[in-house]
Interface confidence: low
């Protein structure tokens, strides 16, 4: 009697996630009587995939009609393949018995799953940093197979070189993850800048996936302050202006101090954006010179994005105002300020 052969013609099969996989198996003889079963893996821990005789296997269908007595093809089709389905599948012939007795196994077919990487997720630093500082961005993508993958970083279209990438796990796995950390030096012009993490993989047919992060989430551009005195008005009032320029984000509180005492506090809101993404804000104060005997020290105090306050002071010379029309005067960079009679911002 010819020895029973269980033939699995393909050593390996590669399938894209979501597709169906066909695993071929034929037997050389229908004798002795007994079922064919499919397992993933070998040994005591193997997993039953399909049993012709019994059980419910919703994702597995026989390629040929197994109920036909002369059928020697026991190939199966597994639908909706996921990376978790990867492994070596064995077609095994049993002799009918109680229990059924294993007679012969095929050589096995290794199923590898080509799984696309997930959309790269780029995360930036937890706290904002200012220009000239280096911040780290992390890019993560998961669930891909095979392991080979290429990751690149770009800032505004220019490729970055300062990054470190790891693919896990190091050994064999059904799917893999990649994590890369890039170091980016910020500049004041980076409010509108973007970093891009680009992932290329065999499953993507040359169309890489991209993840982006806006540097606006990572950068703080501290404001420039300038306090100036406008022309003296005929009603003996001096208009002092505090110009807060080129700052980001918009979260900013401005306090006027008059001889060290808080006069008014304002919060920036709904400001128009500069072309570079930063903001400007102007606040003004009317000082009634005739109401003061001594010079008045005004301070424009700005708290930006929770940072320590920045001050710019300006002394209104009471003695120097015999109602003549003055010219604009810039302030010195020290720090106190005065109480307004009238005030506003724009």
């Amino acid at each position: 009697e010819e020895e029973l052969q269980v033939i699995q013609p393909e050593k390996s099969v590669s399938v894209a996630a979501g597709d169906s996989a066909t695993l071929n198996c034929t037997v050389s003889s229908l004798i002795p009587v007994g079922p064919i079963q499919w397992f993933r893996g070998a040994g005591p821990g193997r997993e039953l995939i399909y049993n012709l005789k019994e059980g419910h296997f919703p994702r597995v269908t026989p390629v040929s009609d197994p109920t036909k007595r002369n059928n020697m093809d026991f190939s199966i089709r597994i639908s909706n393949i996921t990376p978790a389905d990867a492994g070596t599948y064995y077609c095994v012939k049993f002799r009918k018995g109680s229990p059924d007795v294993e007679l012969k196994s095929g050589a096995g077919t290794e199923l590898s799953v080509r799984a696309k990487p997930s959309a790269p997720v780029v995360s930036g630093p937890a706290v904002r940093a200012t220009a000239e500082h280096t911040v780290s961005f992390t890019c993560e993508s998961h669930g891909f197979s095979p392991r080979d993958i290429t990751l690149k970083w770009f800032k505004n279209g220019n490729e970055l070189s300062d990054f470190q990438t790891n693919v896990d796990p190091a050994g064999k796995s059904v799917s893999y993850s990649i994590r890369s950390t890039a170091r980016v030096v910020l500049t004041r012009r980076d409010v509108h800048s973007q970093v891009i993490c680009e992932v290329a993989h065999v499953t993507l047919q040359g169309d890489p996936l991209r993840g982006t992060a806006n540097l606006s989430e990572a950068i703080r551009v501290p404001p420039f302050l300038e306090v100036t005195q406008q022309s003296m008005r005929a009603d003996n009032q001096v208009n002092v202006t505090c110009q807060v320029t080129k700052f980001y984000p918009q979260r900013l509180q401005l306090t006027w101090l008059e001889n060290g005492n808080v006069s008014r506090t304002e919060m920036a809101s709904a400001l128009p954006e500069n072309k570079d993404g930063t903001y400007n804000w102007t606040s003004w104060l009317l000082v009634n010179v005739s109401a003061h005997r001594d010079d008045v020290k005004l301070t424009c105090q700005v708290e930006h994005d929770g940072q320590p306050a920045v001050n710019k002071s300006f002394s209104v010379k009471v003695s120097a105002h015999p109602k003549e029309q003055g010219s604009n005067t810039a302030a010195e960079n020290t720090g106190t300020n005065e109480r307004n009679i009238y005030g506003g911002s724009g």
Epitope: M267, S269, A270, G306
Partner: antibody, heavy 118, light 107 residues
Framework: EVQLVESGGGLVQPGGSLRLSCAAS????????MHWVRQATGKGLEWVSA???????YYTGSVKGRFTISRENAKNSLYLQMNSLRAADTAVYYC????????????WGQGTMVTVSS | DIQMTQSPSSLSASVGDRVTITCRAS??????LAWFQQKPGKAPKSLIY???SLHSGVPSKFSGSGSGTDFTLTISSLQPEDFATYYC?????????FGQGTKLEIK
């Protein structure tokens, strides 16, 4: 389910103290700006205090120096420590979550009653 | 502080009516305006943010409009469950402030 549950209200004498708690579930409290809003019986709503995601705090003028807002991330909870209480502080106090991008209030707690009376 | 003024303070209407409540800010608040509904003994419910955006789960019969200083809340066809007090609120700058409320009563 996203939920805010306040506790800690009660009757207190003028000048006394009370600590309100707000337990958040279904979201990470530290990722949102959080607020306290109060409402005296038969009156309108009044914003009391806020804490930002960076820990920055804000108060309405009448409670400044007396009330302190804080949060404990590990317990996913918000607090309002109320000292030097006055009769005018008598109200239902609501814990409110600020929206993600613009701080618009989206989730309100059921409220806890604070009565300041001798 | 920014003052918020609602009008009317109270309003009587019938089921099926279309009603409009207005809210005026003492200074420009862009569109950082929210509307809330409150029923007796209950916490307020958020209806609208950024003047015209509906919170999740809020029926489309509620609509908001306006920008700058003048805003409106419209309820297109009143149902019994809509009779409540409505508040507007600015959240452009601290301290956040509410309108005094508009009580919508059944006629």
């Amino acid at each position: 389910e996203v939920q805010l549950v306040e506790s800690g209200g009660g009757l207190v004498q003028p000048g006394g103290s009370l600590r309100l708690s707000c337990a958040a579930s279904g979201f990470t409290l530290s990722s949102y700006d959080m607020h306290w809003v109060r409402q005296a019986t038969g009156k309108g709503l009044e914003w009391v205090s806020a804490i930002g995601t960076a820990g920055d705090t804000y108060y309405t003028g009448s409670v400044k120096g007396r009330f302190t807002i804080s949060r404990e991330n590990a317990k996913n909870s918000l607090y309002l420590q109320m000292n030097s209480l006055r009769a005018a502080d008598t109200a239902v106090y609501y814990c409110v979550r600020g929206g993600v991008w613009d701080d618009a209030f989206d989730i309100w707690g059921q409220g806890t009653m604070v009565t300041v009376s001798s | 502080d920014i003052q918020m003024t609602q009008s009317p303070s109270s309003l009587s209407a019938s089921v099926g009516d279309r009603v409009t409540i207005t809210c005026r800010a003492s200074q420009d608040i862009n569109n950082y305006l929210a509307w809330f509904q409150q029923k007796p003994g209950k916490a307020p419910k958020s209806l609208i943010y950024t003047a015209s955006s509906l919170h999740s789960g809020v029926p489309s019969k509620f609509s908001g409009s306006g920008s700058g200083t003048d805003f409106t809340l419209t309820i297109s066809s009143l149902q019994p469950e809509d009779f409540a007090t409505y508040y507007c609120q600015q959240y452009v700058s601290y301290p956040y402030t509410f309108g005094q409320g508009t009580k919508l009563e059944i006629k």
